[in-house]
């Protein structure tokens, strides 16, 4: 969480935002909350980008003004109108690209004052991993597949019942680049794995961690998936 | 007062490079882009590309890459491009003008003429 | 690349018109739409930005209006000192394209 205070002259007002992760080619939001004020005219919010010198978005006296826009973020940024009179200056990115990662800027003007408060957007790929029983191998196989991940992550095999037990000598990892050349989709497969026991499938990189579990007895398999950001600070 | 002060006119030989330059004045030099179009004579405006003089980065249309390079010089708030392998094509005057959707100043043109 | 056309190359005009300069897009831009003067000597300014904006020190004689693929500048009174050539230019998609110029010229 980032807090920032307002300049010199008129009032200091509290702007609040929080560092978020966004999923290349997905929308993300870029969280912004400030001390409301009770006339939407006089609010003004810009979303600025560091290295970049037209604005990201500007919302004033009600409505979109978009005239300083930079062409990076052309059609792609909205705030959410109906909220900027009760404090929310949170902008919504649309089809997110790698190159949009970076600090941004939330400055509000309202008739008590200015403030603003940075945030980091870091971008990448992260999706769900599914754990599967490979019932084509020679021996009982887990295969965990996750469609969309960048930058490369690494991937962990954990056991319930081996617990701290190193799986790296009998699992192998491939990550196949997809079609748009970024992203690249992680197959894991462990082997020699054994009936009554939890196996997870552990994906990461520097932006999410994703784990895949999959549990094996004689007589039902149980997946479970979920999906964690990381380093969601708030500013 | 926002001000673009252009280098003067170049006569050069095909085959060689040229460096023209931009001074900016009446405003914060790393504040806005620094755009370069090109007119040749008696026909309509090219852009060539820009540079944001803050970090030094550059966009080029694609027709002036590895003809044109964009650099500035942030302690003299100036802007340069130069411009090699120069053939009679290259003949034109050369603007620099600042902002980015918009260009709101020009310079007064740097004239450049490539003969042997 | 965005293609900027301005079909009337050269406009002759009386004193006192009221002229107008179009300029079409090949595509939609989005009210990214610029129009410059550029004078004899060469000498280039910016007059309408963002289609309809004028830009600062501008007489409020010249105008602009479009949307989608289809612009115009309308200067209301025309005088002497407005004799040159026009060019719009598109601010919506890198690279920046312009149009032609429309020469304008008294009768």
């Known amino acids: 969480l980032i807090i920032g205070f307002g300049i010199s002259g008129r009032h200091s007002i509290t702007v609040t935002t929080v560092a978020s992760a966004g999923n290349i080619g997905e929308d993300g939001i870029l969280s912004c909350t400030f001390e409301p004020d009770i006339k939407l005219s006089d609010i003004v919010i810009q979303w600025l980008k560091e290295g970049v010198l037209g604005l990201v978005h500007e919302f004033k006296e009600g409505k979109d003004e978009l005239s300083e826009q930079d062409e990076m973020f052309r059609g792609r940024t909205a705030v959410f109108a109906d909220q900027v009179i009760v404090g929310n200056a949170s902008l919504r990115l649309k089809n997110v690209q790698l190159t949009d990662a970076g600090t941004y800027k939330c400055y509000i003007i309202t008739s008590k004052g200015k403030g603003n408060a940075n945030l980091e957007y870091k971008t990448g790929a992260f999706s769900m991993p599914e754990v599967n029983v490979d019932y084509n191998a020679s021996s009982e196989t887990l295969r965990c597949e996750a469609p969309r991940w960048f930058p490369q992550p690494t991937v962990v095999w954990a056991s319930q019942v081996d617990q701290g037990a190193n799986f790296s000598e009998v699992s192998n990892t491939s990550f196949e680049l997809n079609s748009e050349n970024v992203t690249m989709k992680v197959v894991s497969v462990l082997y020699n794995v054994t009936i009554n026991n939890t196996y997870s499938c552990m994906i990461e990189n520097d932006i999410a961690k994703a784990t895949g579990d999959i549990k094996v007895t004689e007589s039902e398999i149980k997946r479970r998936s979920h999906l964690q950001l990381l380093n969601s600070k708030a500013s | 007062e926002v001000q673009l002060q252009q280098s003067g006119p170049e006569l050069v030989k095909p085959g060689a490079s040229v460096k023209m330059s931009c001074k900016a004045s009446?405003?914060?030099?790393?504040?806005?882009?620094m755009n370069w179009v090109k007119q040749s004579h008696g026909k309509s405006l090219e852009w060539i590309g820009r540079?944001?003089?803050?970090?030094?980065?550059?966009s080029y249309n694609q027709k002036f890459k590895g003809k044109a390079t964009l650099t500035v010089d942030k302690s003299l708030s100036a802007a340069y491009m130069q411009l090699n392998s120069l053939t009679s094509e290259d003949s034109a005057v050369y603007y620099c003008?600042?902002?980015?959707?918009?260009?709101?100043?020009w310079g007064q043109g740097t004239t450049l003429t490539v003969s042997s | 690349d965005i293609q900027m056309t301005q079909t009337t190359s050269s406009l002759s005009a009386s004193l006192g018109d009221r002229v107008t300069i179009s300029c079409r897009a090949s595509?939609?831009?989005?009210?990214?739409l610029n129009w410059y003067q550029q004078k004899p000597d060469g000498t280039v300014k910016l007059l309408i930005y963002?289609?309809?904006r004028l830009h600062s020190g501008v007489p409020s004689r010249f105008s602009g209006s479009g949307s989608g693929t289809d612009y115009s500048l309308t200067i209301s009174n025309l005088e002497q000192e407005d004799i040159a050539t026009y060019f719009c230019?598109?601010?919506?998609?890198?690279?920046?394209?312009f149009g032609g110029g429309t020469k304008l010229e008294i009768k």
């Open positions: 595509q939609d831009i989005s009210f990214y």
């Open positions: 009446g405003y914060t030099f790393t504040d806005y882009y």
């Open positions: 003008a600042r902002r980015h959707n918009y260009p709101d100043y």
């Open positions: 963002y289609t309809s």
């Open positions: 230019q598109q601010g919506n998609t890198l690279p920046w394209t």
């Open positions: 540079v944001n003089p803050s970090n030094g980065g550059t």
